[in-house]
């Protein structure tokens, strides 16, 4: 469930603190409820960037697990189509710390509406 997704995000946050990854990532910091699945897709795609940049097995495994969890949760809700949402590349670029904080925020939005 989404609580496990948050715990994975916290784990990633802890793991990257010991590394020096200075990537900037497309970040949706003001998610509109009607675009939350699209925003989630962008967050997950950018997480894969973190995994690549880190070259770390623990981060890699945690990112994959997080994607698996999110996929299964969202697929159980059926196909959700959203329109009029921003493309990932249109989002503001932020550092990893801000990115992860915004990610936790969107997950909490899913928790609150489930």
């Amino acid at each position: 469930n989404w609580v496990n997704v948050i715990s994975d995000l916290k784990k990633i946050e802890d793991l990257i603190q010991s590394m020096h990854i200075d990537a900037t990532l497309y970040t949706e910091s003001d998610v509109h409820p009607s675009c939350k699945v699209t925003a989630m897709k962008c967050f997950l795609l950018e997480l894969q960037v973190i995994s690549h940049e880190s070259g770390d097995t623990d981060i890699h495994d945690t990112v994959e697990n997080l994607i698996i969890l999110a996929n299964n949760i969202l697929s159980s809700n059926g196909n959700i189509t959203e329109s009029g949402c921003k493309e990932c590349e249109e989002l503001e670029e932020k550092n990893i710390k801000e990115f992860l904080q915004s990610f936790v925020h969107i997950v909490q939005m899913f928790i609150n509406t489930s």
């Epitope: 897709k41 894969q48 623990d58 697990n65 994607i67 996929n71």
Partner: antibody, heavy 122, light 112 residues
Framework: EVRLMASGGGLVQPGGSLRLSCAAS????????MSWVRQAPGKGLEWVAT????????YYPDSVKGRFTISRDNSKNTLYLQMNSLRAEDTAVYYC???????????????WGQGTLVTVSS | DVVMTQSPLSLPVTLGQPASISCRSS???????????LEWYQQRPGQSPRLLIY???NRFSGVPDRFSGSGSGTDFTLKISRVEAEDVGVYYC?????????FGQGTKLEIK
């Protein structure tokens, strides 16, 4: 050439336990997630378990969840499948397979071992 | 769970002729990141399965170019442009977009 050698199969009574092993060579074992897939005699393939590269994350179908445990020892380049509370319907050839990462290549099981037969019967 | 349904279950083909196997999923297997994790595996008689195609249409290394994959959403196809004797065996589609990962029932290709 990637090599995967499954072993540990045999005859076991219903309710019994068995541990399968899969020895990996000719690739960096710790860089790959691994899976077990089984095939009952004369039947199709069924996914049984997957484990992440570091071993922290495991995935199972409901048919084996709570009875089977996948694990790995990266220092020994070996994958395991601990099977408890075995049932007649667990009778199958069990294959180990290397799994390409979602992040680097798209999830496929690119190399398979030769399989080991597990027979559950009284 | 995602159910994968293959057709036909048996496929007699003349050597040198084309062959086509269909695989349909009970729901879309496009994942949240936009990827479709659909593979095709070949199992020759008495052998272990072998990867042919991954992510719908990507041929695995060493797989002859007479094998091709196509499709999207819920409908997928494996095509063999000209069947050879070594192609005899059972072909399985497999989805690993969603846990539990699931195989189709298999299609047995035989020579007429």
């Amino acid at each position: 050439e990637v090599r995967l050698m499954a072993s540990g199969g045999g005859l076991v009574q219903p309710g019994g336990s068995l541990r399968l092993s899969c020895a990996a060579s000719e690739f960096t074992f710790s860089n790959y997630a691994m899976s077990w897939v089984r095939q009952a005699p004369g039947k199709g393939l069924e996914w049984v378990a997957t484990i992440s590269r570091g071993g922290d994350y495991t995935y199972y179908p409901d048919s084996v969840k709570g009875r089977f445990t996948i694990s790995r020892d990266n220092s020994k380049n070996t994958l395991y499948l601990q099977m408890n509370s075995l049932r007649a319907e667990d009778t199958a050839v069990y294959y180990c397979a290397r799994r390409v990462s979602m992040i680097t290549g798209g999830w496929a099981m690119d190399y398979w071992g030769q399989g080991t037969l597990v027979t559950v019967s009284s | 769970d995602v159910v994968m349904t293959q057709s036909p279950l048996s496929l007699p083909v003349t050597l040198g002729q084309p062959a086509s196997i269909s695989c349909r999923s009970s729901q879309s297997i496009v994942d949240i990141t936009g990827n479709t994790y659909l593979e095709w595996y070949q199992q020759r008689p008495g052998q272990s399965p072998r990867l042919l195609i991954y992510k719908v249409f990507n041929r695995f290394s060493g797989v002859p170019d007479r094998f091709s994959g196509s499709g999207s959403g819920t409908d997928f196809t494996l095509k063999i442009s000209r069947v050879e004797a070594e192609d005899v065996g059972v072909y399985y589609c497999f989805q690993d977009s969603f846990v539990p990962y699931t195989f189709g029932q298999g299609t047995k290709l035989e020579i007429k």
